[in-house]
């Protein structure tokens, strides 16, 4: 595949990555799948600077990111190391709260109103953000 050199239409370029901000909601798994079909992934926040950029674009709305612990430990969808990486949880989060009555705990992370993170029930239909790296080889065949 060819290397992507500019962002697709309706995506926002920032620091060699492209971001797409949904205006509707999906369950985490559906949002994750949507991004994959766009040759992207749910946003992975690796710095305070990236956090502020995403926060500015989503506004005060619960929004999914590419972080989950559905298989045990917390993991970023692109393989970025969670333990040593950037974190911005709200106080006392994540708490894997079971009291919501929807079944199970809370295994998916989202941005809250003030940008800090919370874990919530993965089936809630929150907005989401896709990200893809400009330097990454795209899946599209090169133009002949």
């Amino acid at each position: 595949g060819s290397e992507r050199t500019c962002c697709p239409v309706n995506w926002v370029e920032h620091e060699r990555s492209c971001y797409w901000f949904s205006r509707s909601g999906k369950a985490w798994a559906d949002a994750d799948n949507y991004c994959r079909l766009e040759d992207a992934h749910l946003v992975v926040v690796t710095s305070w600077e990236e956090q502020k950029f995403v926060q500015h674009h989503i506004g005060p709305v619960n929004t999914w990111m590419g972080l989950h612990d559905q298989n045990g430990p917390w993991k970023w969808v692109d393989g970025t190391d969670y333990e040593t990486g950037f974190k911005n949880w709200r106080p006392e989060q994540p708490d894997d709260w079971y009291g919501h009555g929807l079944g199970g705990g809370e295994d998916c992370a989202h941005f809250t109103d003030d940008g800090r993170w919370n874990d919530d029930v993965c089936q809630r239909p929150y907005r989401w953000v896709c990200e893809t790296e400009l330097d990454k080889a795209s899946q599209e065949p090169p133009l002949l």
């Epitope: 509707s24 919501h100 929807l102 809250t112 109103d113 919370n118």
Partner: antibody, heavy 123, light 112 residues
Framework: QVQLVESGGGVVQPGRSLRLSCAAS????????MHWVRQAPGKGLEWVTI????????YYADSVKGRFAISRDNSKNTLYLQMNSLRAEDTAVYYC????????????????WGQGTTVTVSS | DIVMTQTPLSLSVTPGQPASISCKSS???????????LYWYLQKPGQPPQLLIY???NRFPGVSDRFSGSGSGTDFTLKISRVEAEDVGVYYC?????????FGQGTKVEIK
């Protein structure tokens, strides 16, 4: 304008079935989770059930679990409540209501309600 | 289930005077996202309920600024600064942090 109109209520004998409908207009129905809430004569409000915007998830009050089924047809902008094995205590006005304020946040309360349809279960 | 308890159950108010309704929940309504999921509804005679206040203190668009909501955790209050004739009806609090959604028993407000 935003409107919800319930229909299908009536008098039914205990043990029988009834299907309620709620026709939505004036908003993008397929973007909203939808509730049924009921109110027995002279009593307060009781939440009955919710369905996700795409029908993928449904939850019920214990009092109706296994007897009532919520469904929706987004192509027809219509919400349904199939009520089976009806009991006298199911007698109530049934309201449909949409998740409000932000359609993509189901912690939200209900912001728009229909006028209700009356179900009477009596022999 | 979360139990919502309202007091008083009825209230008779002189027009122009303030009124206050209390709602207590059996569990905290503060969610991990920092919001507190408590709602206030008014059901006028012969009508469906209408949303007044969402997430504890936010007035729903079109609702008079005579209505205000406050509180945190398990204790909440709805205040009407100056009661008018059109405010008569039954007021309900409701929580949405846990399924099932649950309502208070209702507070009937009438004009003296």
């Amino acid at each position: 304008q935003v409107q919800l109109v319930e229909s299908g209520g009536g008098v039914v004998q205990p043990g029988r079935s009834l299907r309620l409908s709620c026709a939505a207009s004036g908003f993008t129905f397929s973007a909203y989770g939808m509730h049924w809430v009921r109110q027995a004569p002279g009593k307060g409000l009781e939440w009955v059930t919710i369905i996700w915007y795409d029908g993928s998830y449904k939850y019920y009050a214990d009092s109706v679990k296994g007897r009532f089924a919520i469904s929706r047809d987004n192509s027809k902008n219509t919400l349904y409540l199939q009520m089976n094995s009806l009991r006298a205590e199911d007698t109530a006005v049934y309201y449909c209501a949409r998740t409000g304020v932000d359609p993509w946040d189901y912690y939200n309360g209900m912001d728009v309600w229909g006028q209700g349809t009356t179900v009477t279960v009596s022999s | 289930d979360i139990v919502m308890t309202q007091t008083p159950l009825s209230l008779s108010v002189t027009p122009g005077q303030p009124a206050s309704i209390s709602c207590k929940s059996s569990q905290s309504l503060l969610h991990g996202d920092g919001k507190t999921y408590l709602y206030w509804y008014l059901q006028k005679p012969g009508q469906p309920p209408q949303l007044l206040i969402y997430a504890t203190s936010n007035r729903f668009p079109g609702v008079s600024d005579r209505f205000s909501g406050s509180g945190s955790g398990t204790d909440f209050t709805l205040k009407i600064s100056r009661v008018e004739a059109e405010d008569v009806g039954v007021y309900y609090c409701m929580q949405s942090i846990q399924v099932p959604w649950t309502f208070g028993q209702g507070t009937k407000v009438e004009i003296k």
